[in-house]
């Protein structure tokens, strides 16, 4: 007869680990016990369990409650051990040696590889500004063992950078992922995906970019100038800008203060029925954490009788 | 001498609560997955429950699930079944073996204990 | 779950006779199968284990066989403390399930 068993047995941190140890007999053989032992290099062998087929499973003291024998079906042959909720300091050399009847006693090792998956933790850089030159957008930082693979997934063109640090039963992997912020990366997810043969799939931490700025004010209202003429109801000056976060608007009147009736309302300024009193330069200033903006404009309020006068002046002038 | 004693049954109404208790004596508890059997008057046998050696796994049959816990207390060489809502059909001689260790068959027996639901 | 169907039933024979008992499972359960032998007011007593190995202390006109879904337990000449009720019990996988059982009767 032989022993069969797995050079290796990979079992993630927390499962139950099952150590193989099959023996492959003749007809007739028997299976008397099987002894296991921790049996790591430049140490004792440090006993496990006994499984004996009269006197039951014994389980030493140092794993009581921890190794058990596997849900059926169990046969005769087999003396496989769960070792219960697997830790890292589980990792290491494991011998099984079982008693046959009549064929004597046979021996076999494995090795337990204990994964410890890694618990990915995503940090932000410095608040993001257009303007700005190479800037760290974020940091993701995932410890495991064996090492994680830590990738970015992103339509946000960047580069990156990783470095890898080793502990004793672990290693812990940090990528960093800089950009050169504009506004168009406003709203973008940055993704940080990290792989670990401990994990049934990818674990994904997303960052929404933020990039502060603020656009070049305007103002809008004054395409056609002779609609600004006395008497004209609803007749209204609109700031147009956009930043992030988004701006503040406060309008003022650079000659002077704002005429009586005219109404401020965010980005709008409106007017009552025009009169000349509304002609003047109106200034928007836009402004947020960032940044801030003017924009002005010169209103005339135009008399349609003097208007038409001058018309008839010039007519009878030629 | 290897031996299973249990003890705990009784007469109970519907909606009862039991808790049986089986004493090993002659081994080592904690070395044996240990399971409980059922066996209604004039019917056959019928597996309850089991638990393993270190009690870290419990399996129960769909007819006591939710209603029936089986434990054991290494220390003291017993196993125990707290049997809660007990029904009509639950009336039976209940049955402690022991799980061989290689094969799972139950190679050693008690003597029973009899529980009886009745209003 | 895994169902068991002893035959026959019931089974009237001699001393001296041979007796064969069926048990057929409702899926594949390889080798995992037990057979115990219980008598009046008595608790079961395991026979064979793994379909076919005899329980020591257990004597020798008592045999198993068969895998699959088809098992045999056999009795090759009947003696009288033999009169006793018999089940199959699979032990492939949870929940465990034992035949209806098979009641030997004296003819």
């Known amino acids: 007869g032989e022993l069969e068993t797995s050079d290796v047995v990979t079992v993630v941190l927390g499962q139950d680990a099952k150590l193989p140890c099959f023996y492959r007999g003749d007809s007739g053989e028997q299976v008397g016990q099987v002894a296991w032992a921790r049996v790591d290099a430049g140490e004792g062998a440090q006993e496990l369990a006994l499984l004996h087929s009269k006197y039951g499973l014994h389980v030493s003291p140092a794993y009581e409650g921890r190794v058990e024998q596997p849900p059926p079906p169990r046969n005769p042959l087999d003396g496989s051990v769960l070792l219960r909720n697997a830790v890292q300091a589980d990792e290491g050399e494991y011998e099984c040696r079982v008693s046959t009847f009549p064929a004597g006693s046979f021996q076999a090792r494995l090795r337990l590889r204990v994964l410890v998956p890694p618990l990915p933790s995503l940090n932000p850089g410095p608040a993001l500004e257009e303007g700005q030159g190479l800037t760290l957008a974020a940091s993701c930082t995932a410890e495991g063992s064996p090492a994680p693979s830590v990738t970015w997934d992103t339509e946000v063109k960047g580069t990156t950078s990783s470095r890898s640090f080793k502990h004793s039963r672990s290693a812990a992997v940090t990528s960093e992922f800089h950009l050169v912020p504009s506004r168009s990366m406003n709203g973008q997810p940055l993704t940080c995906v990290v792989s670990h043969p401990g994990l049934l799939q990818d674990q994904r931490i997303t960052h929404i970019l933020h990039v502060s700025f603020l656009a070049e004010a305007s103002v809008r209202g004054l395409e056609d100038q002779n609609l600004w003429h006395i008497g004209r109801e609803g007749a209204m000056l609109k700031c147009l800008s956009e930043g992030q976060p988004p701006p503040s608007y406060n309008w003022t009147r650079l000659d002077g203060p704002l005429p009586s009736g005219v109404r401020v309302d965010g980005d709008t300024l409106g007017f009552p029925p025009l009169t000349t009193e509304h002609s003047g330069i109106y200034v928007c200033h836009v402004s947020n954490e960032f940044s801030s903006r003017d924009s002005q404009v010169t209103v005339d309020v135009l008399d349609p009788q003097e208007d038409s006068g001058k018309q008839v002046d010039l007519v009878s002038a030629s | 001498e290897v031996q299973l004693v249990e003890s705990g049954g009784g007469l109970v109404k519907p909606g009862g609560s039991l808790r049986l208790s089986c004493a090993a004596s002659?081994?080592?508890?904690?070395?044996?997955?240990m399971n409980w059997v059922r066996q209604a008057p004039g019917k056959g046998l019928e597996w309850v429950s089991s638990?393993?050696?270190?009690?870290?796994?419990?399996y129960y049959a769909d007819s006591v699930r939710g209603r029936f816990t089986i434990s054991r207390d290494n220390a003291k060489n017993s196993l125990y079944l707290q049997m809660n809502s007990l029904r009509a059909e639950d009336t039976a001689v209940y049955y402690c073996?022991?799980?061989?260790?290689?094969?799972?068959?139950?190679?050693?027996w008690g003597q029973g204990t009899l529980v009886t639901v009745s209003s | 779950d895994i169902q068991l169907t002893q035959s026959p039933s019931f089974l009237s024979a001699s001393v001296g006779d041979r007796v064969t008992i069926t048990c057929r499972a409702s899926?594949?359960?390889?080798?995992?199968l037990a057979w115990y032998q219980q008598k009046p007011g008595k608790a079961p007593k395991l026979l064979i284990y793994?379909?076919?190995t005899l329980q020591s202390g257990v004597p020798s006109r008592f045999s198993g066989s068969g895998s699959g879904t088809e098992f045999t337990l056999t009795i090759s000449s009947l003696q009288p403390e033999d009169f006793a009720t018999y089940y199959c019990?699979?032990?492939?996988?949870?929940?465990?399930?034992f035949g209806q059982g098979t009641k030997v009767e004296i003819k």
């Open positions: 638990v393993s050696s270190g009690g870290g796994f419990r």
């Open positions: 793994v379909a076919s």
């Open positions: 002659g081994f080592n508890l904690n070395h044996y997955n």
């Open positions: 073996a022991r799980g061989a260790v290689f094969h799972d068959a139950f190679d050693i």
């Open positions: 899926q594949d359960i390889s080798s995992y």
């Open positions: 019990q699979q032990i492939n996988s949870y929940p465990f399930t």
